[in-house]
């Protein structure tokens, strides 16, 4: 039984990129406030976003404690005001979220090409190792720190004037590609976790072309 004038939350959805994780739900509150709880399958429930009028709750601080755990959240609806005035103090309404395993499900954020350096007919392209909100020993871990060899990058590159694209992959954050001397190339990168069944690929990085500021050229 729910308390008077409250409705259960619905459409509970996890929104997560590089472990920044927010639970969203509906409806916008009229006569109620929400409290969110999160737990692992074996753990205790922890309350977050207490008595909030928002319809989202940032759960990053909780999930980064162990990104390989599976989490469940639930959203409670409480009447917007003192319970006594609503005439009922029954169990509050709540709705469960889908299960969420950050390591397997967080979206890979858009990568950034940090730099590229041409030496003769070779170009070294470096993808930025993005910082996540996952901590170890009071320092924030990078995407590579968290995923290790599970994470690869794919580089798509082509002659500036051509439509034919080539690809290269790396288990690090660096590519070494062959180019023709005196020819400008463009490229973008994509983060990939091949072992995943969902959310395997990031969106494409912005395109960078040789001759732009990020590049260095040496004979």
């Amino acid at each position: 039984s729910g308390t008077t004038n409250t409705v259960a939350a619905y459409n509970l959805t996890w929104k997560s990129t590089n472990f920044k994780t927010i639970l969203e739900w509906e409806p916008k509150p009229v006569n109620q406030v929400y409290t969110v709880q999160i737990s692992t399958k074996s753990g205790d429930w922890k309350s977050k976003c207490f008595y909030t009028t928002d319809t989202e709750c940032d759960l990053t601080d909780e999930i980064v404690k162990d990104v390989k755990q599976t989490y469940l959240a639930r959203v409670f609806s409480y009447p917007a005001g003192n319970v006594e005035s609503t005439g009922s103090a029954g169990e509050p309404l709540y709705e469960n979220s889908p299960e969420f395993t950050p390591y397997l499900e967080t979206n890979l954020g858009q990568p950034t090409i940090q730099s590229f350096e041409q030496v003769g007919t070779k170009v070294n392209v470096t993808v930025e190792d993005e910082r996540t909100l996952v901590r170890r020993n009071n320092t924030f871990l990078s995407l590579r720190d968290v995923f290790g060899k599970d994470l690869i990058y794919t580089l798509y590159y082509w002659k500036d004037s051509s439509t034919g694209r080539k690809t290269n992959t790396t288990h690090t954050n660096e590519f070494l590609i062959d180019v023709e001397k005196g020819v400008s190339y463009c490229f973008f990168a994509q983060a990939v976790i091949p072992s995943r069944t969902v959310n395997r690929k990031s969106t494409d990085s912005p395109v960078e072309c040789m001759g732009q500021e990020k590049g260095e050229f040496r004979e």
Epitope: K28, T35, Q37, F76, N82, V83, S85, A89
Partner: antibody
Framework: QVQLVESGGGVVQPGRSLRLSCAAS????????MHWVRQAPGKGLEWVAV????????YYADSVEGRFTISRDNSKNTLYLQMNSLRAEDTAVYYC????????????WGQGTLVTVSS | DIVMTQSPDSLAVSLGERATINCKSS????????????LAWYQQKPGQPPKLLIY???TRESGVPDRFSGSGSGTDFTLTISSLQAEDVAVYYC?????????FGGGTKVEIK
């Protein structure tokens, strides 16, 4: 009339534990959210913890998170605060307070119980 | 966290005169959906627990004398005692209940000049 009576305070050494109680009467205890608020000697008010009327949801100030646990027994009309790993900075008068017209507006307060953490 | 800042720290006012206490929040405590300011004022006399005076920034609690009034919106609020009485000597606190953690101002001590 509404009454809130705290007990369980005293002098305790750093690192030790203490459990405070707040006995409620004169109102339907199970229908109200309850809070602990503290006041260090000569200082201002600091919110410590809250528990919803049903006892399901609890929330804590960062300064006590992981060390203090708020709970309630609606059959006994009693609110509790279990305080572990006490520190000198936890020295304060601890008040229990009842949610009023809205969550976090305190219409009734107990008289408080003094907790002194000292070696 | 929302930080509440009160001014002045102390205030000496003659009996029958007006006392004004200010409270500023680090972010708005106005909830646009119901146009209410989630701010309360409390009075605390020596050796006693606090007593609720005002909630929703301007609504007097039952039994509170009408010489006490609250005003303001968003981030700036005022508690006014229109004609100070001897029994009003106390410390006054503002508190936001807009979001957790709940936070109080540092208090303003009101004395008789």
């Amino acid at each position: 009339q509404v009454q809130l009576v705290e007990s369980g305070g005293g002098v305790v050494q750093p690192g030790r534990s203490l459990r405070l109680s707040c006995a409620a009467s004169g109102f339907t205890f199970r229908s109200y959210g309850m809070h602990w608020v503290r006041q260090a000697p000569g200082k201002g008010l600091e919110w410590v913890a809250v528990i919803t009327y049903d006892g399901i949801n609890k929330y804590y100030a960062d300064s006590v998170e992981g060390r203090f646990t708020i709970s309630r027994d609606n059959s006994k009309n009693t609110l509790y605060l279990q305080m572990n790993s006490l520190r000198a900075e936890d020295t304060a008068v601890y008040y229990c307070a009842r949610d009023g017209v809205y969550y976090g507006v305190y219409d009734y307060w107990g008289q408080g119980t003094l907790v002194t953490v000292s070696s | 966290d929302i930080v509440m800042t009160q001014s002045p720290d102390s205030l000496a006012v003659s009996l029958g005169e007006r006392a004004t206490i200010n409270c500023k929040s680090s972010q708005s405590v106005l909830f646009s959906s119901n146009n209410k300011n989630y701010l309360a004022w409390y009075q605390q006399k020596p050796g006693q627990p606090p007593k609720l005076l005002i909630y929703w920034a301007s609504t007097r609690e039952s039994g509170v004398p009408d010489r006490f009034s609250g005003s303001g919106s968003g981030t700036d609020f005022t508690l006014t005692i229109s004609s100070l009485q001897a029994e009003d000597v106390a410390v006054y606190y503002c508190q936001q209940f807009h979001s957790y953690p709940l936070t109080f101002g540092g208090g303003t001590k009101v004395e008789i000049k």
